[in-house]
């Protein structure tokens, strides 16, 4: 009997990209007359269904309608590919394909890992009290949540407060704050993506006299 094989490692996609999932029968077997079901998590959550020699779009979950195409150019050899367009973070998770003849079925399961690389961090000054400078570093559009860090002149980690929230698309916005003294030197804020091993960084130089003292004079007529 044939077996079904799917992607042998997690499929990677960035938000906004298209993804392709492939399933094939081994040994090669014509699957034109079989049911091919791509599903999400559980068998009944249909991403795309091919049955009776044609696609069955009315069986799809609403969030996949208009976003999938079953590539059947090699279905006679038992090879089927599903394209999923315009990936969002909500698409991340386990997927499977189940191929069934009248008397037999097999399935394969794999993971879709979705990532989004956020913006270059923006460092701003939020306060200046008793020669202490309050810094804020903001970056948006990440998935999953990045590791956010302040680093000192020698690259040492600096303790920090961080806040995270999610936007309407499920992406993470991160901000971290830090209080430093006027002569702190070179301070950097970095955001690191866990899966992609990518890091974005911004740097600011805090000099000895960051703000010059100003003498105020009252102008009188």
């Amino acid at each position: 009997q044939w077996q079904v094989f799917g992607p042998d490692k997690p499929v990677q996609a960035l938000v906004g990209e298209d993804a392709a999932f492939s399933c094939f029968l081994s040994p090669k077997t014509n699957a034109e007359a079989m049911e091919v079901r791509f599903f999400r998590g559980q068998f009944s959550s249909v991403v795309h269904l091919y049955r009776d020699g044609k696609d069955q779009p009315f069986m799809q979950m609403p969030q996949y309608q208009g976003r999938t195409k079953l590539v059947k150019d090699s279905i006679a050899e038992g090879r089927i590919s599903l394209r999923l367009e315009n990936i969002t973070v909500l698409d991340a998770g386990l997927y499977g394909c189940r191929i069934s003849s009248q008397s037999y079925y097999q399935k394969a399961i794999w993971e879709l890992q979705v990532s989004a690389l956020g913006s270059v961090p923006l460092i701003s000054i939020t306060g200046y009290v008793d020669r202490d400078i309050q810094l804020l570093c903001q970056s948006s559009g990440w998935f999953p949540r990045p590791t956010a860090k302040w680093k000192g002149p020698q690259g040492q980690d600096l303790s920090t407060d961080s806040r995270t929230n999610r936007d309407m698309h499920g992406l993470f916005d991160v901000e971290i704050s830090l209080t430093v003294q006027e002569n702190a030197g070179s301070i950097s804020c970095s955001m690191r993506h866990a899966h992609l091993s990518r890091e974005v960084e911004s740097r600011v130089q805090i000099g000895d006299t960051f703000f010059e003292p100003i003498s105020w004079h009252l102008a009188t007529k």
Epitope: E17, A19, S22
Partner: antibody
Amino acid sequence: EVQLQQSGAELVRPGASIKLSCTASGFNIEDDYMHWVRQRPVQGLEWIGRIDPANGNANFAPKFQDKATITADTSSNTAYLQLSSLASEDTAVYYCTREGGLYYGNSDAMDYWGQGTSVTVSS
Amino acid sequence: QIVLTQSPAIMSASPGEKVTITCSARSSVSYMQWIQQKPGTSPKLWIYSTSNLASGVPDRFSGSGSGTSYSLTISRMEAEDAATYYCQQRSRYPRTFGGGTKLEIK
């Protein structure tokens, strides 16, 4: 065997329109996406757009949005590219290509190309 | 749209020499394709999904990369490898191609 047979060379006047054809054999075009790519003389490849012949949905590169129309006829297994308001800078070889399913690495790619149609726009 | 920049634009290599062509994307993509074209002929798929060789491509070719940086490498240059190579991203619309690298034999 998969083949893409394109229509013959065209010599047209500025301002005219033409319709190029790409007839597939060895597979059904509705099972794939069909793309059009152009190559101006001594230049690189430029993606024009693609169609999903199963439903007629098409995407275009922004610069070709008002220049190109892509259609498909699944009964004749043929994809078409219509170009309007032709100018000398549209002189190029136009290729059709199939984006087929490739089964290693979980991706797909433009795996078969037509022989190209040469379009010359000249007065 | 995702702009792809190839380097070098033109290069020549001696038979047996190792050759590397790079493709830099202005923003990250998950996969890259490479296409070979010889003068007067249609383009051919050469490498897909970053590192998979298309049917009939000699195993002296390899592809690698991730994110914004991708490359095509020939371990030992041969005369038949002289051609123009284009990188192409299939991750987003509009699909885009690099400007091409013309590889000549010395």
